[in-house]
Amino acid sequence: TLNSVLINSNAIKNLPPPLGGAGGQPGSAVSVAPGVLYEGGNKYQTLDNYQPYPCAEDEECGSDEYCSSPSRGAAGVGGVQICLACRKRRKRCMRHAMCCPGNYCKNGICMPSDHSHFPRGEIEESIIENLGNDHNAAAGDGYPRRTTLTSKIYHTKGQEGSVCLRSSDCAAGLCCARHFWSKICKPVLKEGQVCTKHKRKGSHGLEIFQRCYCGEGLACRIQKDHHQASNSSRLHTCQRH
């Protein structure tokens, strides 16, 4: 069941230079049909079968994880980096993403989120919490997961196009999805809309322009008239169960 999925290492990665040109910049085709070129994948892990998951940045890890070298607290130190369990209250940290949901990094210590701690423009950093298109959710609020008091109580919900950290930051009918260098609120997909079918578990995503998941009662499936097409060009749309 969905509830047994305890850790989601969401492999939404950046386009590597060979595909995307210098520095991972997409071609102009992304502007025309965002997301169509890039298929992503998710890695689901249960606590009784936990495998270290390689990563380049926090965004590729689950909501209760951050990206770092196993022997060091901060990412980017060199060597292989993997998704590590987030740090609980009063543990040392270097950035918000290292702290578990509901906490943020203040003066090197994970502290409980309290809106009064944040000056204007300050942010509680996290990662995308989209488990993918095969799990359907109530529009706008994703899947069973921890949410923070900060997200739920202290600030207004973001409209489409606003910066977000998680889907609970966004208004009803929207989810928080990757948008090039940032994450913004985007519409949950409706019936008939093109969706991204995440392939096998553990495959690395290449979405720099991420779509939301399909809305309630919908699943991301191959469009019927595209069955004959080659695997690489199959079009997926949100369809009724």
């Epitope: 950046n14 386009l15 520095g23 991972g24 910049q25 997409p26 102009s28 992304v30 502007s31 025309v32 965002p34 380049a56 940045e57 926090d58 965004e59 990206c67 990412a75 980017g76 270097m94 950035r95 918000h96 993403a97 990094c105 809106h115 944040f118 000056p119 204007r120 423009g121 300050e122 942010i123 509680e124 950093e125 900060t150 997200s151 202290y154 600030h155 207004t156 919900k157 973001g158 409209q159 489409e160 196009g161 606003s162 910066v163 977000c164 950290l165 930051d169 948008h179 090039f180 260098w181 940032s182 913004i184 609120c185 720099i208």
Partner: antibody, heavy 124, light 107 residues
């Protein structure tokens, strides 16, 4: 108080190099996407480059690709723009910009906060 | 690239006037558009995000509307401090692109 202060501008000859810095304060630097935007004298704004919050993804305008490199040092709260093979058309004020936050009221947007800029003049 | 065409390029108006600036995208950009104000020698200031969201500290005489390809920035009653250049920015596609600017001058 969010503050972005650019430095490193100056006069350089065509073909030369320059490294711009943007020192940030008043916020947790490592949590934000950052950008360089330039403005030639008397002209409009032109996006130059962006970098994701942890620095893994970088993006460049076609006009600077292969010549400019954006980077960040989260331990120093500083954003950089290494500019090589400079041309006369690179002459501009270079601004550092930062995205907003979901905790802004209302929730923030991209390119929300800007520094005051540093002038780069490429001339022989 | 997505082209942003701003009009007019300049306008003369008096204090108290209602001023409208438009921005047209070469393709649909949903509501992924910001409006900025820039005064001479100063950095741009974000006025409106996502086409219509007034930013904190920005006077309510500024408003934004539109979606898709056509967008409008309206100043309901022009004040002396509003004389400046205004830019739109689309962030729907890469690269992000600005309009060429609209200079609002005193009549």
């Amino acid at each position: 108080q969010v503050q972005l202060v650019e430095s490193g501008g100056g006069l350089v000859q065509p073909g030369g190099s320059l490294r711009l810095s943007c020192a940030a304060s008043g916020f947790t630097f490592s949590n934000y996407g950052l950008h360089w935007v330039r403005q030639a004298p008397g002209k409009g704004l032109e996006w130059v480059s962006s970098i994701s919050y942890y620095g893994s993804s970088t993006y460049y305008a076609d006009s600077v690709k292969g010549r400019f490199t954006i980077s960040r040092d989260n331990s120093k709260n500083t954003l950089y723009l290494q500019m090589n093979s400079l041309r006369a058309e690179d002459t501009a004020v270079y601004y550092c910009a930062r995205d907003g936050s979901h905790m802004d009221k209302p929730p923030g947007y991209v390119f929300a906060f800007w520094g005051q800029g540093t002038l780069v003049t490429v001339s022989s | 690239d997505i082209q942003m065409t701003q009009s007019p390029s300049s306008l003369s108006a008096s204090v108290g006037d209602r001023v409208t600036i438009t921005c047209r995208a070469s393709q649909g950009i949903k509501n992924y558009l910001n409006w900025y104000q820039q005064k001479p020698g100063k950095a741009p200031k974000l006025l409106i995000g996502a086409a219509s969201s007034l930013q904190s500290g920005v006077p309510s005489r500024f408003s934004g509307s539109g979606s898709g390809t056509d967008f409008t920035l309206t100043i309901s009653s022009l004040q002396p401090e509003d004389f400046a250049t205004y830019y739109c920015l689309q962030y729907y596609g890469m690269p992000p692109t600005f309009g060429q600017g609209t200079k609002v001058e005193i009549k």
